[in-house]
Interface confidence: low
């Protein structure tokens, strides 16, 4: 099982620092926008962890930005946001739809706005139940 | 411009307690982890812990847990560490940083002494 | 706890120079780990966070290499204002921890 983890670990971690870099690859960065949706987390160990990709940096005032389905809906209360910006694309992971050509990204307006939890323990918590 | 200000050093005796400060401003304080990092005599670093002060969970390294604890007021923008039974193994400056990954910026630190 | 081994302890170069900081961590770290740069009596200041992402106002002759287990900090063009200590440490896992520093003195 440990191996399993680390093998996981090793996959997510790719998949974040490859994000979006690959329009004709999606297939595993929309498994990873998947888990994120479903378990309700962002990133591998915090939301940090997508600052590292370059496509995904804001420099300076510019808002730092994370894949889409790292937002928590129940906090967003911003209907502009939700209507014209995400639910758009989370309608698509909640179908598992496999139609994106790019990822999709979306800015963090505030920090409340995305999971604050990163996915490793509720992961490993599923690892361990499975 | 991000600032994290200290309070000032703090001469303790051997078994006292204190609470050391870090007020925030300059940034969304509920944002950020906020982590606080011991240095001995100039030297080596050590990572007590973090505090997120959005929800207010705490994440302790091992070896300070028990003689640390961290808190925050959301409301003035301000984090806490209380540090117990202090000894002299305690007297070290110690910085709150601030965290996105890693720490991105630092207060002045607050010197603490302890001696009887 | 991941144990962080920082070489050289000190070392000594002249301006313009150029200076390599390296770092071995006991476990992968994948590129969770980052260089600070503390002048005396100041606070540790971010220089390169993910192990090759300059911080904000960090000049470009600092540069960060490596993942997993091996890290390194470059400094290139060396100016007197480079002179201090210099610390690695990673953010992997609880508990984050540091090298040991390198003393950086400008001959």
């Known amino acids: 099982r440990a191996q399993l983890e680390r093998s996981l670990r090793d996959v997510v971690e790719k998949t974040i620092q490859k994000y979006g870099t690959n329009p004709e690859e999606t297939a595993a960065e929309e498994s990873w926008d998947y888990v994120q949706f479903q378990l309700r987390c962002c990133g591998w160990h915090y939301p940090q962890d997508w600052f590292q990709v370059l496509i995904l940096r804001g420099n300076g005032s510019e808002a730092h930005r994370v894949p889409c389905s790292c937002y928590n809906l129940s906090a967003t209360n911003d209907s502009t946001i939700l209507d014209k910006v995400i639910l758009p694309q989370l309608s698509r992971l909640g179908h598992l739809a496999r139609s994106r050509h790019s990822a999709d990204i979306c800015a963090v307006p505030a920090e409340s706005h995305i999971y604050r939890e990163g996915c490793a323990q509720g992961l490993q918590k599923w690892l361990h139940n499975n | 411009a991000v600032q994290l200000q200290q309070s000032g050093p703090e001469l303790e005796k051997p078994g006292a307690s204190v609470k050391i400060s870090c007020k925030a401003s300059?940034?969304?304080?509920?944002?950020?982890?906020m982590n606080w990092v011991k240095q001995n005599n100039g030297k080596s670093l050590e990572w007590i812990g973090n505090?997120?002060?959005?929800?207010?969970?705490?994440t302790y390294n091992r070896k300070f847990k028990g003689k640390a604890t961290l808190t925050v007021d959301k409301s003035s923008s301000t984090a806490y560490m209380q540090l117990k039974s202090l000894t002299s193994e305690d007297s070290a400056v110690y910085y709150c940083?601030?965290?996105?990954?890693?720490?991105?910026?630092w207060g002045q630190g607050t010197s603490v002494t302890v001696s009887s | 706890d991941i144990q962080m081994t920082q070489s050289p302890a000190s070392l000594s170069a002249s301006v313009g120079e150029t200076v390599t900081i390296t770092c071995r961590t006991s476990?992968?770290?994948?590129?969770?780990l980052a260089w600070y740069q503390q002048k005396q009596g100041k606070s540790p200041q971010l220089l390169v966070s993910?192990?090759?992402t300059l911080a904000e106002g960090v000049p470009s002759r600092f540069s960060g290499s490596g993942s997993g287990t091996q890290f390194s900090l470059k400094i290139s063009s060396l100016q007197p204002e480079d002179s201090g200590s210099y610390f690695c440490?990673?953010?992997?896992?609880?508990?984050?921890?540091f090298g040991g520093g390198t003393e950086l003195e400008i001959k």
């Open positions: 300059g940034y969304s304080f509920t944002g950020y982890n």
């Open positions: 940083a601030r965290s996105v990954g890693p720490m991105d910026y």
């Open positions: 476990e992968n770290v994948y590129s969770y």
């Open positions: 440490q990673h953010h992997s896992d609880n508990p984050w921890t």
């Open positions: 993910f192990a090759k």
């Open positions: 505090i997120d002060p959005y929800y207010g969970g705490t």
